[in-house]
Interface confidence: medium
Amino acid sequence: AIELVPEHQTVPVSIGVPATLRCSMKGEAIGNYYINWYRKTQGNTMTFIYREKDIYGPGFKDNFQGDIDIAKNLAVLKILAPSERDEGSYYCACDT
């Protein structure tokens, strides 16, 4: 079975300082899948952020960078200049 595991359950972030979220794939090669990132905010709304390759949700392209690290079997999401509005729970998902 495939499992996507966040590197950290909680990521402390400083305003304006780039932050990186990582999600590790267990049981399969990450290169065989498309990775997606979502953010869930307090109102339980799930918002699409990024999908390979270079597909971003509205308003996310300028402040987020998604990528995969084939060597480490990781999905990576960078928040370039975090602010309070970026608070929330981030989810990685995969599909073919």
């Epitope: 305003i15 690290d69 060597a71 602010s83």
Partner: antibody, heavy 119, light 110 residues
């Protein structure tokens, strides 16, 4: 129009402290998407990143020079100051400051200031 | 010793295509985007490519960038005499919490 201008001494003696000032205009040092780096380039050599100051005043340094470097800012004067202690002739270089504008990278550079370390 | 690795030189005749490679690691190119800078003789570096493959306004479309894994490349198609310059790749490094540069590639138009 965004500009950065480096200023400081042209000649410094070995063991002295070098102080360089980067005066910026056209953007705010506290803008969340803006930050400033110092980079140097010895004659005929590659670019070397020295230090970085983020919009929230956090700093990061080149690990090999960290003990000798200090970066700070004065937002009221729109200035970023770099100090390098105990200089040596190998510190002879052109020193640049550059704005980092995310996600665009270092999109505006100063013209650079040449510093020679010699007795 | 630069963190990112570039060939020291590259050359071509006018009109030719020249490609410059840039190799890094998972903490820089592997998890961040790559920028390219052009430095004409006696001048400050200028941003040429950002976010792997994006050109700032005013940069000719003869310049293109790409990235794969922990490596990136810059291509100059239709080489012109005014392209003689040093080209540097750069990327943010998560371990250093700062940008890292390549050693630079000097492009000569024969």
């Amino acid at each position: 129009q965004v500009t950065l201008r480096e200023s400081g001494p042209v000649l410094v003696k070995p063991t002295e402290t070098l102080t360089l000032t980067c005066t910026v205009s056209g953007f705010s040092l506290t803008n969340i998407r803006m930050s400033v780096s110092w980079i140097r380039q010895p004659p005929g050599e590659a670019l070397e990143w020295l230090a970085h100051i983020f919009s929230n005043d956090e700093k990061s340094y080149n690990s090999s020079l960290k003990s000798r470097l200090t970066i700070s800012r004065d937002t009221s004067k729109s200035q970023v100051v770099l100090t390098l202690t105990n200089v040596d002739p190998v510190d002879t270089a052109t020193y640049y400051c550059a704005r980092m504008r995310l996600p665009y990278g270092m999109d505006v550079w100063g013209q650079g200031t040449m510093v020679t370390v010699s007795s | 010793q630069s963190v990112l690795t570039q060939p020291p030189s590259a050359s071509g005749t006018p009109g030719q295509r020249v490609t410059i490679s840039c190799s890094g690691s998972t903490s820089n190119i592997g998890s961040n985007t790559v920028n390219w800078y052009q430095q004409l003789p006696g001048t400050a570096p200028k941003l040429l490519i950002y976010s792997n493959n994006q050109r700032p306004s005013g940069v000719p479309d003869r310049f293109s960038g790409s990235k794969s894994g922990t490596s990136a490349s810059l291509a100059i198609s239709g080489l012109q005499s005014e392209d003689e310059a040093d080209f540097y790749c750069a990327a943010w490094d998560d371990s250093l919490n700062g940008p890292v540069f390549g050693g630079g590639t000097k492009v000569t138009v024969l």
